[in-house]
Interface confidence: medium
């Protein structure tokens, strides 16, 4: 019939996509010192790319404005970086000891929309 | 030598990645009524997935805290949606006329980090 032969636009799928794919893991750069809460250390690179939940929650849901996009599964991943620590005074100024270290940063593997039962005031 | 044989950790590449891939086009759901600033119309779906710049600017840059992730190239894309408009009162309640409409929404194709010359106070 006419209906079988025609190409269709699936609005339900578009609606689902807005809900499903707007809150997903995505790239963010994090400052290693801030992330590890270390003040007296310098890293190279200063920042690393991590996967963190972001975007917004598909606004097709009821009370969508009261929803937040949170991690549903977090894993710790190792990253190799150079760590510099202030050393002793030398003739040519402050020396730094350098080491290649493995640090662990949180990566979000799955994201969920967490919605409060009632919208914000 | 030992250094040649050992697989190198390319820290420069990690540094570049943090700058390059943290500010990129990513999925966001937008409320069509809000986006088009239309009050007396209802759409299905209410929301659509669009590509908008997001993330943060690679914090390896100087004054990275004063940088914002903005669209470097924006294109308008068509989306088919159903538009309902309140009709006249009928016996069985308020009638709605329905139309399939093509709306245009902004999609960000490229993102740039725009940094002010000095950091915020």
């Amino acid at each position: 019939s006419y209906h079988d032969r025609k190409s269709k636009v699936d609005l339900d799928r578009l609606n689902d996509d807005a809900k499903r794919y707007s809150c997903t893991p995505r790239n963010y750069s994090v400052n290693i010192r801030e992330e590890l809460k270390l003040a007296n250390v310098v890293f190279f690179p200063r920042c690393l790319l991590v996967q963190r939940c972001g975007g917004n929650c598909g606004c097709g849901t009821v009370n969508w404005r009261s929803c937040t996009c949170n991690s549903g599964k977090t894993v710790k991943k190792y990253h190799e970086v150079l760590q510099f620590e202030p050393g002793h005074i030398k003739r040519r100024g402050r020396a730094k000891t350098m080491a290649l270290v493995d640090i662990q940063l949180d990566h979000h593997e799955r994201c969920d929309c967490i919605c409060s039962s009632r919208p914000p005031r | 030598s030992y250094h040649d044989r050992k697989s190198k950790v390319d820290l420069d590449r990690l540094n570049d990645d943090a700058k390059r891939y943290s500010c990129t086009p990513r999925n966001y759901s937008v409320n069509i009524r809000e986006e088009l600033k239309l009050a007396n119309v209802v759409f299905f779906p209410r929301c659509l997935l669009v590509q908008r710049c997001g993330g943060n600017c690679g914090c390896g840059t100087v004054n990275w805290r004063s940088c914002t992730c903005n669209s470097g190239k924006t294109v308008k894309k068509y989306h088919e949606v159903l538009q309902f408009e309140p009709g006249h009162i009928k016996r069985r309640g308020r009638a709605k006329t329905m139309a399939l409409v093509d709306i245009q929404l902004d999609h960000h194709e490229r993102c740039d980090c725009i940094c002010s010359s000095r950091p915020p106070r």
Partner: antibody, heavy 126, light 107 residues
């Protein structure tokens, strides 16, 4: 604003050829099925041909089958009708019109012939 | 092929009259039918789709009803701008077919 603009009509001798074009704007042409409809002077409307969004399905009225060819160029937002072996009875105003089918909430809804072009006149006469 | 028989082929009516036009399909077409209005020298304009749904922007004095093989277009109170020719169209199966048209004239 949705617009369909036909062109290419004119006077042609029986047995001759013409190519009609329909330029589309203001909507996502590549997702719509497109149609040609004609109207002979003082007569009613007659469906001529349809083409699906990706050109995978094409249909013709028996009266034009084997003589007319419908095609589209989604990159150019254009619909075409190649008319060969024209006859006097092909004299008409030719309109292009769009149609689409959508599914939502388990319902299939057809939005067909909601926008038409202004028409282009084809006259087949010796 | 599905034949669409439209009646009457013409009618005369006055402003304010209630006008009814019918279309009969030679076989069941569910609600896959639309109604169009055409004025001289102009392209057709869709009034009703899916047998009974009013096209956005069309006055509510126009209404459609029916399913299967019998369909009706009603103009509840004829206005001066409604004098035109009206066509039904079935899109249940190819070839798509129009009714023969109904010319609504001023009495």
């Amino acid at each position: 604003e949705v617009q369909l603009v036909e062109s290419g009509g004119g006077l042609v001798k029986p047995g001759g050829s013409l190519r009609l074009s329909c330029a589309a704007s203001g909507f996502n042409f590549r997702t719509y099925n497109m149609n040609w409809v004609r109207q002979a002077p003082g007569k009613g409307l007659e469906w001529v041909s349809s083409i699906s969004s990706s050109s995978s399905n094409i249909y013709y009225a028996d009266s034009v089958k084997g003589r007319f060819t419908i095609s589209r160029d989604n990159a150019k937002n254009s619909l075409y009708l190649q008319m060969n072996s024209l006859r006097a009875e092909d004299t008409a105003v030719y309109y292009c019109a769009r149609d689409i089918m959508i599914t939502f909430g388990g319902i299939i809804a057809s939005f067909y012939f909601d926008y038409w072009g202004q028409g282009t006149l084809v006259t087949v006469s010796s | 092929d599905i034949q669409m028989t439209q009646s009457p082929s013409s009618l005369s009516a006055s402003v304010g009259d209630r006008v009814t036009i019918t279309c009969r399909a030679s076989q069941g077409i569910r609600n896959d039918l639309g109604w169009f209005q055409q004025k001289p020298g102009k392209a057709p304009k869709r009034l009703i789709y899916a047998a009974s749904s009013l096209q956005s922007g069309v006055p509510s004095r126009f209404s459609g009803s029916g399913s299967g093989t019998e369909f009706t277009l009603t103009i509840s109170s004829l206005q001066p701008e409604d004098f035109a020719t009206y066509y039904c169209l079935q899109h249940n199966s190819y070839p798509l077919t129009f009714g023969g048209g109904t010319k609504v004239e001023i009495k």
